[in-house]
């Protein structure tokens, strides 16, 4: 896969992903009422991070917000948190990306810089997307824990007339917003892995390396940290073999005007 | 200003069937679910099912499932409700009546009286 | 089936008494998600209609005069009628509005005397 398309890829998914996280941030089913033990509801209970819904069965549905900081529960406020720095994350790494594209021209920006921001980009959409999941995953553990500590204590009786009286507690199970956030954080990781392989694609084979040059009777020896390479050239009309050093020429290149790189 | 108004008395021979309607007037048909209730001379109110005028999809007691068919048509803003196998026990007064915020009914209809009589 | 259970059945009072009516649930009908109960009172006078009076337990219906106020929660339920008018002749159910099937009280008759 070329590097503007493995980069363009990578994008779409982020931006894809990042729509995802909004849309699940944004949502109220976080939570929906299990009807498992209560199947002919007329009431329907589902919360999100920001309001908690009622729908009845004549179809009218009030939602009310949550106006308190102090009386929410401390893991709901960390996936608010978890939520909004992955959107905020998200932001940033879209519009850098955008500067980013190779297929985007952008003044005198050269490769390097796009390779640099391509990498910020997609490690911001990784982070961004990381957050997302640990956010909706927290919440699930929540449900989850909730779940069967409120099973454990579903029916309590009471005495009433003719013996006992039935109280229902309402549980809670997965909402879509779940699902929906899963599906984004991971897409938005995904897009922000793409974007960290376009990157070394925008960057020349050796440039992750230190080089020093000898020059000796006409040829040119590169040694590399981290095993021995070395490229020799023989003969008066052997070209000095191109190595860069962010972004720096050796002396010999002034011919040398590549319009491609070996992809890594 | 909202109306149900509901078909005329009947009297139908035992193991038959009747269908009853339930005209709607003065708001938005498919915006509000329609429930039916029966009522037997001198005693209470028993909850038969609803259909949604939007879905068209109903939701049956139990103890009524089978022999009542609700259905509504959108374009006269009608509900119907048809029931079968009639016996003496039917004999009652079938109400239609509109549900609201709540859960509650706020508009009835006036009643068709239904007698199973041979 | 949520059994609604009404008591008394009947009643008989003079003009402008305070009446009280009950109604209770074997069920909880409380939904934790908006803290309502839904429990609704409807008076159905002689050769009418039922009339929808009160929702949610407490929520007076628009028209609906202000001497009749309902209160309870949970599972226990009451009607007040302030001061009993010749009109409010009639009998009155409640209803379960809670879960399906709806079900409906055996009424309690309001005579005047």
């Known amino acids: 896969m070329s590097v503007t398309a493995c980069q363009g890829l990578g994008f779409v998914v982020s931006l894809i992903g990042f729509a995802g996280i909004i849309a699940a941030t944004c949502m109220d089913q976080w939570s929906t009422q299990d009807l498992y033990n209560n199947p002919v509801t007329a009431v329907f209970n589902y919360q999100g991070l920001w309001r908690s819904c009622v729908r009845e069965s004549s179809g009218f549905t009030e939602c009310r917000g949550y106006f308190t900081l102090l009386g929410l529960p401390a893991m709901l406020q960390a996936v608010r948190a978890l939520m909004i720095v992955g959107i905020v994350l998200g932001v940033i790494g879209i519009l850098v990306s955008i500067f980013a594209l190779k297929c985007i021209r952008i003044g005198s920006m050269d490769d390097s810089a796009k390779a640099k921001m391509t990498l910020t980009s997609g490690i911001l959409f990784i982070i961004s997307g990381i957050c997302a999941i640990i956010g909706v995953s927290v919440f699930a553990n929540m449900l989850v824990t909730n779940f069967w500590m409120s099973t454990a204590n579903m029916y309590s009786g009471m005495g009433g007339m003719g013996g006992m009286v039935q109280t229902v507690q309402t549980r809670y199970t997965f909402g879509a917003a779940l699902f929906v956030g899963w599906v984004a954080g991971g897409l938005t990781l995904i897009g922000g892995v793409m974007m960290c392989i376009a990157c070394r694609g925008l960057t020349p084979d050796d440039s992750n390396f230190k080089a020093v040059s000898y020059h000796a009777s006409g040829q040119n020896v590169a040694y590399r940290p981290g095993g021995f390479k070395a490229s020799t050239g023989f003969g008066s009309n052997t070209r000095n073999k191109k190595i860069y050093d962010g972004g720096a020429r050796t002396e010999d290149d002034e011919q040398s005007h590549p319009t491609k790189y070996d992809y890594v | 200003e909202v109306q149900l108004q509901e078909s005329g008395p009947e009297l139908v021979k035992p193991g038959a069937s009747v269908k009853m309607s339930c005209k709607a007037s003065?708001?938005?048909?498919?915006?509000?679910?329609i429930h039916w209730v029966k009522q037997k001379p001198g005693q209470g109110l028993e909850w038969i099912g609803y259909i949604n005028p939007y879905t068209d999809g109903p939701k049956y007691n139990e103890k009524f499932k089978g022999r009542a068919t609700l259905t509504s048509d959108k374009s006269s803003s009608t509900a119907y409700m048809e029931f079968s196998s009639l016996t003496s026990e039917d004999s009652a007064v079938y109400y239609c009546?509109?549900?609201?915020?709540?859960?509650?009914?706020?508009?009835w209809g006036q009643g068709t009286s239904v007698t199973v009589s041979s | 089936d949520i059994v609604m259970t009404q008591s008394p059945s009947s009643l008989t009072v003079t003009a402008g008494e305070k009446v009280t009516m009950n109604c209770k649930s074997s069920?909880?009908?409380?939904?934790?998600?908006?803290?309502?109960?839904?429990l609704t009172w409807y008076q159905q006078k002689p050769g009418q209609p039922p009339k929808l009076l009160i929702y949610w337990a407490s929520t007076r219906e628009s028209g609906v005069p202000d001497r009749f106020t309902g209160s309870g929660s949970g599972t226990d339920f009451t009607l007040t009628i302030s001061s009993v008018q010749a009109e409010d002749l009639a009998v009155y159910y409640c209803q379960n509005d809670y879960s399906f099937p709806f079900t409906f009280g055996s009424g309690t008759k309001l005579e005047i005397k």
């Open positions: 003065g708001y938005t048909f498919t915006n509000y679910i």
């Open positions: 009546a509109r549900l609201n915020r709540g859960n509650a009914m706020d508009y």
């Open positions: 069920q909880s009908l409380l939904n934790s998600g908006n803290q309502k109960n839904y």
